[in-house]
């Protein structure tokens, strides 16, 4: 999905109002410095692409993030403010259901959510100096 035509201001507002709090709750008891940055993004559409990938694509180390509250709210936000997003997700959801569930390593999920927080922070930040 191409996130270029999303309403970034609305997505940012949703993130600050709800999604961020759920991510921080998930990470409670963990310092942000416990994990180094292993993923980045270079503009708002790119950030949303990487956020979607980390949130909804199961990995061998962390298979279950899509069921978390922050993931559900992320999905709802993208469906609301990115034209045509929900249609593109129907096939992806059906494909996901066919995958076998793997055992989750909690620490690896914490690491993945830490990366998600970093991506969201890049998405909402007012940029560096422009010279």
């Amino acid at each position: 999905y191409d996130f270029t035509n999303c309403d970034f201001q609305k997505i940012e507002a949703d993130y600050l109002r709800t999604i961020s709090k759920d991510l921080i709750t998930y990470m409670s008891g963990t310092k942000s410095t416990d994990f180094n940055n292993t993923v980045s993004c270079s503009n708002r559409p790119h950030c949303l692409t990487e956020i979607q990938s980390l949130t909804f694509n199961p990995t061998p180390r962390c298979a279950s993030l899509a069921k978390e509250m922050f993931a559900r709210k992320t999905k709802a936000t993208l469906a609301l403010w990115c034209p045509g997003y929900s249609e593109t997700q129907i096939n992806a959801t059906q494909a996901m259901k066919k995958r076998r569930k793997r055992k989750v390593t909690t620490n690896k999920c914490l690491e993945q959510v830490s990366q998600l927080l970093g991506l969201w922070r890049r998405f909402i930040r007012t940029l560096l100096k422009k010279q």
Partner: antibody
Framework: QMQLVESGGGVVQPGRSLRLSCAAS????????MHWVRQAPGKGLEWVAV????????HYADSVKGRFTITRDNSKNTLNLQMNSLRAEDTAVYYC???????????????WGQGTMVTVSS | SYVLTQPPSVSVAPGQTARITCGGN??????VHWYQQKPGQAPVLVVY???DRPSWIPERFSGSNSGNTATLTISRGEAGDEADYYC???????????FGGGTKLTVL
Amino acid sequence: QMQLVESGGGVVQPGRSLRLSCAASGFTFRTYGMHWVRQAPGKGLEWVAVIWYSGAYIHYADSVKGRFTITRDNSKNTLNLQMNSLRAEDTAVYYCSRSPQWEDIFEAMDIWGQGTMVTVSS
Amino acid sequence: SYVLTQPPSVSVAPGQTARITCGGNNLGSYSVHWYQQKPGQAPVLVVYDDSDRPSWIPERFSGSNSGNTATLTISRGEAGDEADYYCQVWDMSSSLVVFGGGTKLTVL
């Protein structure tokens, strides 16, 4: 852990070519801008080239423009530097480094490789 | 192209504060990054975006940037801080990375 490992250095005669590689691991390579930086013996750091996270755009230092080519393969997590028409002044340790980018701004180089030595001598 | 100027060397007594400067035209409008390099090793990022510090760098390292000068401050200097320090910016107007010439820090 996050790692960059350079290879391909060696001794080469002036006018000849050499290809350096940098293998990335432990992070999502395709989301970072990647640089080559060199350091001549006893001298300071000199930036050589950068390639955008997507490979769409490339920038070179004037000293290597037209002779060096930076490329990346995001499917293999590798960065390359093809060096042609080598000169004695290209003798240096060559480092690859990663940097987050935002739009057309490259941020700090937060991970560096250990370097590979290139000696241009007849 | 853009030029960054650093003093070739700076000395500090153990436990004292070292300040390494980096000069450039209107440097305060650029984001300045600082690297530490010990002999035979690769550079290590110690301060980015003028004053931010990677999680693995001690709080003794700090940075500031305004006007035409950026400063890397190392408080309570230790023997292990002896190294070359480089400032760096991304020059958007020319799409080039620019490094300062480097400063050798000696802990007396």
